[in-house]
Each structure stands twice: as C-alpha cells, then as structure tokens.
Amino acid sequence: GGGGAAPTETQPPVTNLSVSVENLCTVIWTWNPPEGASSNCSLWYFSHFGDKQDKKIAPETRRSIEVPLNERICLQVGSQCSTNESEKPSILVEKCISPPEGDPESAVTELQCIWHNLSYMKCSWLPGRNTSPDTNYTLYYWHRSLEKIHQCENIFREGQYFGCSFDLTKVKDSSFEQHSVQIMVKDNAGKIKPSFNIVPLTSRVKPDPPHIKNLSFHNDDLYVQWENPQNFISRCLFYEVEVNNSQTETHNVFYVQEAKCENPEFERNVENTSCFMVPGVLPDTLNTVRIRVKTNKLCYEDDKLWSNWSQEMSIGKKRNST
C-alpha cells in the first residue's frame, strides 16, 4: 500500500529574540535564524502576538507594530520550512515588553487628540487620580514626516482637562494620511506613569466652519452657496444646512451629502464652493441660514466630528408685528 507523506521535521527555535522601542510607540522585535536548521529548508518565520492575534508567516527576521505602550505586549516567534499555516512551526519563543513603570493611578486618562482643519492637532487629557494638583505635564509627539520626537510647547488648561496643541499640516504626499501620530504624556518630574496614544490621521478630524457666500431666492426656493473650509475637497465632506424662519418660527435642518453647484442660479466655477437649494421658502419673510460640515467615510474613517456652525446669514424681510 502507498504510505502518506513523511511527517515534516520540526525546526529548531529562533535565537536571540529581542525587542526595542523606536519613536514613541513603534515596537520592534528582531531575531536570528535557528541554529542547526536543515539545509534543504527555506526558512520562514511564524509569529503572533500573545493573544494569538495577527498571525504572520514571513521570511524576515523582524516584526514591528505601532501600539500605545499602556500595557504589556508579547510576540511569539517560531521557524518553519514553508508558508503553509498548517505546518507545525518550531517551539515558539516569546519576548515581551512592558510599559514604563509607575503607579497606574498616576497616569493621565482620556488622552485624545483632534486634528483641526488638517492644520494643527489638539490633544487633551485628565490628570491621574494619584497625582499632585501642581503636576507639570509634557506631551511628546512623533509622525513619519518628523525626523525626531518633538515636545509640545503650548500646554493649556480647559476646566479639569489639560491640553496641548501643535502644528500638523497635511503634506501633499499621498501616503501621509495613511500614517498615525504617536503621542506620549508624562510629567516633568518623572513621578507619573507615562500614557500613550496613537492617532490615525484618517480619524478625529474636525474641519473649520464653512463660510456662506451667497443667499438668493428663485421662485419659492432659497439658493445657498458657501465656501468649504481650506484643506478639504467637497466630495470628502457632509453638510448640515439649518434654515430658521422668523415668521413661522420653523426650524428646518437639511442633511446634505452632495452639494454641487450645477444649477444655473448658482455662481459657477468658484473653487471649493458648494451649493444647496432649500425648497418652499417664503421670500417675504426673514430666513436665517447657518451651515456646518464634517468629514465623510469616502475619505476618512471617522464621520462624527462636526465643525462649529458657520456665521449666520439672513435674507428676506422681517414683517412688522401688527
């Protein structure tokens, strides 16, 4: 009878597995090939994180991950002779990295950042429970277009929250927004446990408010034309147009996904301008319009942060009360 294929020989474990941190939140594991691997073996390395996440089989003797170092993270690595996931790898070797030491109750909480109009990032946090009220905080940040880690200079206070803002301008490089900003907050005296965050540049984007350029009536329709905030193209934004009528005391809100200026009533070919027609508006009454915008999922991961409202603009006549 024809016997099955001979069982694959298990490879020896990898050697010299080590771990280091680059920038603020880039964790890199490196290792050496196993000693005494069989000569007819084309070495591949199987690796996964401690919770069996992100399995990977690759020929490189390194693996990196961008992760906020707020908790311990471990990588297990083994060697094998093929890319076949069903092949049993060598004994797995594990190497872990722990967050910086310190009382967890001293670490800041709610560390969050918002990228304002793709021009500056504003981060805020709450002090840790177990800290002195006069703690002086420092925020460090890094992203790919920076050569080194930078310290944020503009620390401020908003109520119970501390914050810091730094310039971050969208680079024309098409891959810029596929990256993240790495953030760390600690205190000057080194008494608190540092806190980390990673802010993807496709999320937490808050545009500036739009600017209403023109309101005009055509029959019983109100034509609204506005300028979008700088740095955004109109197809990447959603809009909310609010119209308040002083006579009827109605308050209409229109959620606008596309705001093209295709109607002949609109001024044409004005760059970065959007338009919307509000139907059934009484021209002989006072109508007040304001608009806000937010990023949409066509261009961004996040669509939750509305801009502030634009300045109001009014059209029509206020009727005399009799």
């Epitope: 709610e110 969050q112 709450l126 429970r129 177990n130 800290t131 002195s132 908003e158 119970q160």
Partner: antibody, heavy 118, light 107 residues
C-alpha cells in the same frame, strides 16, 4: 453664575425606577465632571456616581453598581441618573455637584428628594 | 476603600472659641482631602481644598492643615453662623469617601 439644578425626585415603590436630571449653567459644561452624592435622612454624605466632562470615564459606588446609570448630554448641559430596582435604602436627598481641579466639589445643587416606599 | 474617621462626632461650643475638627484616613492620601460645611436644610459648601487651600469667598477664620493620613479643620473665633455639619472628603482614589461628619452646635 455657575449653578446646577436637580429635578426628577419623588415617591417610588421598591423595585421601581426614576430618572434624575441635573441641568448646569454658567460654565463650559463639557470640561467638567459631574457627580451625584446622596444623603439619607439624618445621615452623612455618600458618593454615588461620577461622569467625566467628555463622558468617557464613568464610576459608580458598589452600592448602586448594576442598578444606576449615569449619562450626560453635552448639547443640553444636562447629566442624568437613571435609577432602577430601587430599594428602601436608596431613600435620600440626591445632590448634583460640579467637580473642579483634582476632584473636589466646588458647586452643589439644592438636591432632589427620592423616597422609596410601598 | 479609604475610610475617613472624623472626631469629634458632635461639639457644643461658644462663640469666639477656637474649634478643631480632625479627619484621619485609613491610608495615605497625600493632600487630596477637602472640607465641606452643611448648614441645616442646605446643600454642602466647599470650605477647604487640597487639605489647606481656602476656597474663594470662605471667611479667613476657616483653615486646614495636614497631609498623608492626618488632617485638621480649624475655625478661629467661632461665629453663630458656623453652626453646621462639617465633612471631610478624599479624592485620592475611587470610591470617593466622606467622613461621617462633625456637628457643631453653638451654645
């Protein structure tokens, strides 16, 4: 003037529910945590629950965990305390307090009385 | 949880007298201790924050001291309007806790 004002108290049977509201004014609402503290008749103060300014951090006393839910609507400058499965020992005046700095209460409301009785 | 024990529970004093109320924490809380005054049928009011810092608008006769586990609220030259319950409160760790209160009565 900075102030907080509680409402929604009343008489409820054991096992019943009640929702308290705390309306705030005079400060930038989403920059401050708000806390519910209660005081049973003739007794001392007992911390109940806290919600941070942005609403990401929420804490409860063990005595109410799983029964009470704190929430906030920053567009309405209001914090809520949803109280379910009420017991006689929940009878108290419920105060809403604004937190400042490292977690002290600088502004208190007048309180709203919750009575749990059959 | 951190237990705060106040003493005395009750004190009857005459105007102009100096009053001392102590608050002891079951473990060290640094300076995260605050004092409140509650007059009958009123809500509490903040007197002292961070163990020794007077809150704005509070009369200068009220002062606080201490750190770690032992804290003191002192009222120099008591006035009739100071008849109230006084509570200490720790914010060093959750759950927040209050002392059981000290009731001051004016003779």
């Amino acid at each position: 003037e900075v102030q907080v004002l509680e409402s929604g108290g009343g008489l409820v049977q054991p096992g019943g529910s009640l929702r308290l509201s705390c309306a705030a004014s005079g400060f930038t609402f989403n920059n401050y945590a708000l806390t519910w503290v209660r005081q049973a008749p003739g007794k001392g103060l007992e911390w109940v629950s806290t919600i941070s300014g942005r609403g990401y951090s929420i804490y409860y006393a063990d005595s109410v965990k799983g029964r009470f839910t704190i929430s906030r609507d920053n567009s309405k400058n209001t914090v809520y305390l949803q109280m379910n499965s009420l017991r006689a020992e929940d009878t108290a005046v419920y105060y809403c307090a604004k937190e400042e700095g490292h977690w002290f209460f600088d502004v208190w409301g007048r309180g709203t009385l919750v009575t749990v009785s059959s | 949880e951190i237990v705060l024990t106040q003493s005395p529970d009750f004190q009857s004093v005459t105007p102009k007298e100096k009053v001392t109320i102590t608050c002891r924490a079951s473990q060290s809380i640094g300076s995260s201790l605050h004092w409140y005054q509650q007059k009958p049928d009123q809500s509490p009011k903040l007197l002292i924050k961070y163990a020794s810092q007077s809150f704005s608008g509070v009369p200068s006769r009220f002062s606080g001291s201490g750190s770690g586990t032992d804290f003191t609220l002192t009222i120099n030259s008591l006035e009739a309007e100071d008849a109230a319950a006084y509570y200490c409160h720790q914010s060093s760790s959750l759950p927040y806790t209050f002392g059981q209160g000290t009731k001051l009565e004016i003779k």
